[in-house]
Each structure stands twice: as structure tokens, then as C-alpha cells.
Interface confidence: low
């Protein structure tokens, strides 16, 4: 029985040329996370494997950086980056959990940054 839930940064917006942090958090389960995939529509952006660590897809290596945590940092944003992003948690024994984030990249300087972090 899958009891876990995925929390995400939800719908976020950012300025063209800027950076944004995509975050997902799997909670309410004791399942072991074996791998997290980050995907944009049908394209694989990055993988974080429990044994092998991070792998960034070669076509995104210049613009995608790992972290914080299992999150992903996107930089040099363009309007073409607008769209759905998915964090896919592969777990044992539960199976697969998927979280969805919608990113809108705006031309203007009124973009509202959804991914904020509090400094302890």
C-alpha cells in the first residue's frame, strides 16, 4: 500500500535569463528511495541514484545543476523552459511516486519566485 505523499514547489514563475530551484519532498512513508528522476515533459533532465549519485543529461549539463538536496537548479532560463516538470521517486517497496511542478518563464521583471528557502 502506497502511503507516501509528494510535496512540491507547485506552480512557480521566474524571469527569462534567471535561475529557479525545483523541489519535491516525499513524506509519510518509510519506503527506501532508490532513485529520483527529474523530467520535463518527455525529456529526462537528471537522475539521482542512491548508489551512483547524480547524472545530468548531456543536453542539459550547461543549464541544470544538482541540488539543494534532491532538488534541481535551472539557470539561463528561456521562455521555452515554460512547462511541466516532474520529480519521479522510485522507492522500495512502495513503487513510484510522481510530483508535478509547472514553471512559467516570464519576459518581464514581475516574475514571482515560488522557490524560497528560509535560512536557519
Amino acid at each position: 500500500m502506497m502511503t507516501g505523499t509528494i510535496e512540491t514547489t507547485g506552480n512557480i514563475s521566474a524571469e527569462k535569463g534567471g535561475s529557479i530551484i525545483l523541489q519535491c519532498h516525499l513524506s509519510s512513508t518509510t519506503a527506501q528511495v532508490t532513485q529520483v528522476n527529474w523530467e520535463q515533459q518527455d525529456q529526462l533532465l537528471a537522475i539521482c541514484n542512491a548508489d551512483l549519485g547524480w547524472h545530468i543529461s548531456p543536453s542539459f549539463k550547461d543549464r541544470v545543476a544538482p541540488g539543494p538536496g534532491l532538488g534541481l537548479t535551472l539557470q539561463s532560463l528561456t521562455v521555452n523552459d515554460t512547462g511541466e516538470y516532474f520529480c519521479i521517486y522510485h522507492t522500495y517497496p512502495d513503487g513510484t511516486y510522481t510530483g508535478r511542478i509547472f514553471l512559467e518563464v516570464l519576459e518581464s521583471s514581475v516574475a514571482e519566485h515560488g522557490a524560497r528557502f528560509q535560512i536557519p
Epitope: 519532498h25 528511495v33 539521482c48 549519485g53 547524480w54 544538482p66 541540488g67 539543494p68 538536496g69 534532491l70
Partner: nanobody, 117 residues
Framework: EVQLVESGGGLVQPGGSLRLSCAAS????????MGWFRQAPGKEREWVAS???????WYADSVKGRFTISADNSKNTAYLQMNSLKPEDTAVYYC???????????WGQGTLVTVSS
Amino acid sequence: EVQLVESGGGLVQPGGSLRLSCAASGFTFSPSWMGWFRQAPGKEREWVASVLRGGYTWYADSVKGRFTISADNSKNTAYLQMNSLKPEDTAVYYCTTDRGYNWNYDWGQGTLVTVSS
């Protein structure tokens, strides 16, 4: 308990250099990556650079060609060499990392870098 301790900040003139260090301790196992963020007064915290345990590095566009991130895996220490510093680089610089492989990650207390003549 994971601890991240940054050092190396200070006052430097425009065009000058600084080297920041971040010593990480208390890990159950070594982090897969380490990184630097910064926060200028009145602004949001922004990502600066990341380095994978395997050595691959990434940089924000604003620091490319001026900053170099590196790590000594045996010491769980990350470094940020900052050259050709500009007044707009003035900020508190924070080190961050994951705790090996899980969601949790940690922040250091930060080190202040002031670029001014």
C-alpha cells in the same frame, strides 16, 4: 549532527580575490554534492555554484569565468575561489550540501563578502 562551517569572507576591493572554504562534518556518509549560494541585502538567496563528488561543476551565469568551485572529497570540504570581484558580489555566502542520499540538506551560517573601494 551535520555541521557546515564557512570561512574566508572579508572586505576586498573591486577586482580583488577571495577564497571561501566550507568544512562539512557529522555525515553518516559523504555528500554527493556541495554548493554555494549567496544572499545580498534585501534580495533573495541565489545559487552561485555546485560541484559533484565526481568533480563536475556548474556556475551561475553571473559568476562564470570569475569564480571556481572545487572540493576535497577526503576532507568533505568545498572551496570557492572568487576572482575579479565586483561590488554586486557583495553578499553573505552560504555553503550547502545533502546528507548523502536523502531529501534533507543543510546550510552553514554564512560568511560575509564585501566588495568595496
